[in-house]
Every structure is written in structure tokens, then in C-alpha cells.
Interface confidence: low
């Protein structure tokens, strides 16, 4: 209840996260032009990326374009990109939708289609659907430890969500263990009323809300966090212009002294940690 006699102050907060878990993925692996089936192991360094601010990202799905090299090649025949003669292709033109700079030539992409030749990382990325089910669907069982330090400078009071008495092997549960700061990703989605398996395909943004309602008076002191969860992105993927959450990154390597890269379009969940609340003291 609102204590009108108290002086209220908003929380100042810092957050640090640590994700743990191993995923195993069955996928086609291309080695020396030969495609083989392989099981790949993904650890924390493979599926998490450092983000600025109170966020962390877990990759749940991906599309790879392997063995790209900087050269000339036909661009991917996306809608409106096909040509029948050089006239359609403008030398030096950079179409924002294209993956390179046009050379002015119309060249065969395959047996039936021709597209403008581009100077780019080749072969250019194909427009592929995200694999379904998601390749790292087992990320549902990953856990995240959230360390949250808070401060009320006006009241000269500092605390954190992790208590010395906490068990490092606990897992957050709304009823049985509401103060545990280790969260299973699948449980976060369940609490938010969302289906992890479904969101993992295209990616999404999930909010972890930490609410501090602190009474700092010595006679009725209470200052512990309350956790809640909600999805922050537009879940209507069919209707939204760019569904889900994804970005591209590349792994570079040299083969016969030629720089090459593997382009990875990573789909996943960005977790935003939103800390709010007040501290009140007489």
C-alpha cells in the first residue's frame, strides 16, 4: 500500500547475465564440396552474443551461406530481380535489396533464369525459409543467471537479487522458488503464455521484468524483487512486415590464400531485462 509519509526514490540498476546450456544440431555439413550429415555441438560461445544494455541474445535457428568469396556472380533471383538482356542491368548500380554492385551484364543464374551480375560475396545468399522445427529448439532447456544490483542513492541503500543463502542449483518457479535468479528459458515463455518451439523458428523479443517495491524503514524493512515475463515483439508474424528477430554475421577464414566467409543468418530470442521500482523511507 502507498505510504504517503515516505520519501520515494526510483531504482538505479545494473544487470549482468550468464547463459548456460549445450545444444546438439543435426545438419548438412559441406566439406570440400561434399555435403555430409553431421551432428554439431553448440555451446555458449556459439549461440550467445554480447549485447549492449540490459539484453542478451540466444540463437535458436539459423540459415548458412557457406564458402562465399568476393567475386562476380549472378544475384539471387528474388522477385523483380530477373533480367532478359544487359539493358536491364545498370553498371555501378547498388540496389538496396541486392547483395552487391551491378556490373551491367545479364547472366544465367540457373538453367531457366537470368539475373544481373554483381560484384559481391558469392554465391549470393539465397532467400531461404528459417528451418522448421528450429535447429536449436533444445535451447528451451538452457538457463540464464540474472545478477541485478540496485541502488537508492538518496537513501544510501544498495542490495542485489542474489542472496548469500541462495542455492546455485535452484531454478525459478513462481510458486516454489520465486526468489531464485536462475531461469529456464522454456519456463520464461510458459510464464508469458508463449510457445517456445514456435517462437524459436523466426525469433522474437521477450521481456523479463524485475520489480523492486522497497520499504526501507527499519521497523518494516522489505526489499526483494518480483519477476514477471511478457513478449515484447509483434507475435502476429503473418501480419507483421518483418516477422521475428534475426541478424546476419560472418565467420571469415582463408582457403588457398583466398579470403572466404560463412554467412550466418541467426534467428533467436532477444531477452530484454526491464528493471523498475521505488524505494521508500520515512
Amino acid at each position: 500500500s502507498d505510504k504517503l509519509y515516505q520519501r520515494k526514490e526510483p531504482v538505479i540498476s545494473s544487470v549482468h547475465t550468464k547463459v548456460k546450456g549445450i545444444a546438439e544440431v543435426t545438419e548438412n555439413v559441406t566439406e570440400g564440396g561434399v555435403t555430409k550429415l553431421g551432428h554439431s555441438i553448440f555451446d555458449t560461445a556459439d549461440y550467445t552474443f554480447p549485447l549492449q544494455g540490459n539484453s542478451f541474445f540466444v540463437m535458436t535457428n539459423y540459415v548458412k551461406s557457406e564458402g562465399q568469396v568476393q567475386t562476380l556472380c549472378p544475384e539471387y533471383p528474388r522477385r523483380g530481380a530477373q533480367c532478359s538482356s544487359d539493358r536491364r542491368c545498370k553498371k555501378g548500380w547498388m540496389d538496396p535489396q541486392s547483395k552487391g554492385i551491378q556490373t551491367g551484364r545479364c547472366v544465367p543464374y540457373d538453367k531457366t533464369r537470368k539475373t544481373c551480375e554483381v560484384s559481391a560475396w558469392c554465391p549470393t545468399e539465397e532467400e531461404k525459409e528459417a528451418p522448421r522445427p528450429a535447429l536449436l529448439r533444445s535451447a528451451e532447456n538452457f538457463t540464464v543467471l540474472i545478477k541485478n544490483n540496485i541502488h537508492f542513492p538518496g537513501h544510501n541503500y544498495t542490495t542485489r537479487n542474489i542472496l548469500p543463502t541462495m542455492n546455485g542449483s535452484c531454478t525459478f518457479h513462481k510458486t516454489w522458488d520465486p526468489q531464485c535468479s536462475i531461469f529456464r528459458l522454456g519456463d520464461i515463455f510458459q510464464e508469458a503464455g508463449e510457445n517456445f518451439t514456435e517462437v524459436a523458428v523466426q525469433g522474437g523479443i521477450m521481456g523479463i521484468e524485475i520489480y523492486w517495491d522497497c520499504n526501507l524503514d527499519s521497523w518494516s524493512h522489505h526489499c526483494r524483487p518480483r519477476y514477471s515475463f511478457r513478449r515484447l515483439d509483434d507475435k502476429n508474424t503473418d501480419e507483421s512486415f518483418v516477422p521475428g528477430y534475426n541478424f546476419r554475421y560472418a565467420k571469415y577464414y582463408k582457403e588457398n590464400n583466398v579470403e572466404k566467409r560463412t554467412l550466418i543468418k541467426a534467428f533467436g530470442i532477444r531477452f530484454d531485462i526491464l528493471v523498475f521500482g521505488t524505494g521508500g523511507k520515512f
Epitope: 546438439e24 543435426t26 555439413v29 566439406e31 555430409k36 550429415l37 553431421g38 551432428h39 555441438i41 533444445s138
Partner: nanobody, 122 residues
């Protein structure tokens, strides 16, 4: 000493089911696979499962009929064979691989069981 011991083979009518088991001792493998060899034919890939029991892959001829699963606690891999056909008649071998690459190729499997005979009569 590494040992892979298969069991569960036998004679079954077309359309019937069998479950093969393979108990592993002496080593833990990253990938476990089942292969089969019919008389006068080459050894053929059937199915593989990674360390994560959810992670499995099947040969085209058995997709939708066979299920591979793994119990890491018991060091056992199973092959549940449903809707069996006479062309499934073969000796079935269990194999273990320390590698997770190219798991449909028998070359990566370092350790093999003795095999168990499966006969499907029409």
C-alpha cells in the same frame, strides 16, 4: 574393452514390429547408429542418434517406420521397427562413433556389434 551387444532380432510377419537393443560398455560414443546388411548386398545406413536423444536421422527406406532412441543412463540405444516389410530382412548392426560428422557413413563408426538377424516373412 569396448563392447556393443545387440539383441531383439527374430522372425516376424510383414506388417509386424520388433525392437532391437544395443548395450554399450567400455566407452561413451557421441553418435550411435544402426546399419543393416541383406544377403549379397552392401551394408546400408538405417538410423543415427546423437548424444541428445532428440537428435536423430534416418535412411530414406525406413523414414516414418523406424524410430531410434537412446538411453544415456543405461548406455543403450534402441531401434523400434514398425510396419516391417520383407525387404527389411537383414543382419542389423549397432555401431558407435566418437565423431559427430558424416554420421550416415559407416567409415566414421569405429566400434561395431556382432549383429542380430531380422527376418520378415510375407
Amino acid at each position: 574393452e569396448v563392447q556393443l551387444v545387440e539383441s531383439g532380432g527374430g522372425l516376424v510377419q510383414a506388417g509386424g514390429s520388433l525392437r532391437l537393443s544395443c548395450v554399450v560398455s567400455g566407452r561413451t560414443f557421441s553418435a550411435m547408429g544402426w546399419f543393416r546388411q541383406a544377403p549379397g548386398k552392401e551394408r546400408e545406413f538405417v538410423a543415427t542418434v546423437g548424444w541428445n536423444p532428440m537428435n536423430s536421422y534416418y535412411g530414406d527406406s525406413v523414414k516414418g517406420r523406424f524410430t531410434i532412441f537412446r538411453d544415456n543412463a543405461k548406455n543403450t540405444v534402441y531401434l523400434q521397427m514398425n510396419s516391417l516389410k520383407p525387404e527389411d530382412t537383414a543382419v542389423y548392426y549397432c555401431a558407435g562413433s566418437g565423431s559427430l560428422l558424416d554420421v550416415t557413413s559407416e567409415a566414421v563408426y569405429t566400434d561395431w556389434g556382432q549383429g542380430t538377424q531380422v527376418t520378415v516373412s510375407s
